[in-house]
Amino acid sequence: YDFTNCDFEKIKAAYLSTISKDLITYMSGTKSTEFNNTVSCSNRPHCLTEIQSLTFNPTAGCASLAKEMFAMKTKAALAIWCPGYSETQINATQAMKKRRKRKVTTNKCLEQVSQLQGLWRRFNRPLLKQQ
């Protein structure tokens, strides 16, 4: 999906008012310096592409983020503010249902959510120069 035509300010507002705290709660008990940010993004569409990938695509060691509350809210926000997103995701969801995993919090998942927090921070500050 091409995130170019999303309403970025509406997504930012949704993140600040409904998603950010759930990411923090998921990470509770871990130090903010525990994980290095290794995933970056260059602009808002790119950030959303990376956020979508890290949130919904199972990875080695962390197969369960898609069923977390922050993921559900992310899915809902993208569907509302990214034209055509819901249509493109319907087929993908049917495939996902066949391999849905039980929610398990692993160290790898914590690292992945830490990366997500960094991507969201970058999304919210689009005018900053890339480090």
Epitope: A14, S17, T18, I19, K21, K67, M69, K73, A76, Q89
Partner: antibody, heavy 117, light 107 residues
Framework: QVQLVESGGGLVQPGGSLRLSCAAS????????MSWVRQAPGKGLEWVSG???????YYAGSVKGRFTISRDNSKNTLYLQMNSLRAEDTAVYYC???????????WGQGTLVTVSS | DIELTQPPSVSVAPGQTARISCGGD??????VYWYQQKPGQAPVLVIY???KRPSGIPERFSGSNSGNTATLTISGTQAEDEADYYC??????????FGGGTKLTVL
Amino acid sequence: QVQLVESGGGLVQPGGSLRLSCAASGFTFSSYYMSWVRQAPGKGLEWVSGIFFDGETYYAGSVKGRFTISRDNSKNTLYLQMNSLRAEDTAVYYCARQQYFDHIDIWGQGTLVTVSS
Amino acid sequence: DIELTQPPSVSVAPGQTARISCGGDSLGGKYVYWYQQKPGQAPVLVIYGDSKRPSGIPERFSGSNSGNTATLTISGTQAEDEADYYCQSYTNALSTVFGGGTKLTVL
């Protein structure tokens, strides 16, 4: 303007079935997470069920296995199929738009379901 | 999973400040929303994201949430604020949960 209009409520005997409908207008229905919330007479609000744009569903424990939520995005309509109805299911049923799988920003006017012999 | 506890009733004199509490285990780690419901009407969202007001909701409505308690505050309460108020949050099992409701009486 944004509107949700429920229909299908009425009197039904215990063990019976009923299907509620909710017609949505004024917004892109196919993009939103939608829910049903009920309120027994003189009681508080109880969330019943919700459904994503892609058909992914969630249920309260009290109705799981008896109620089925569905949607027809081409008709901008939300449904609630209620089977094996009990007296405690008597309530006003509200159709609701649940913003971001989160808070309810739009409510219908409600439809009364009475389960009694 | 989380249960939300509200006082059944709160009374306030016109022009005074009304505070309605909503308690739940580690509630501060979740978002809380507040609804106003008047007799015979559907509920109306008055606070979302702990403390944000939807457009059209008067400034006298405010919210906070920390620890195990969320609070809806109505400053300079008016007669028209008399209603039932419900808090709402969510569970780890991805379901929506409401408090039992608080009847606000403006004396």
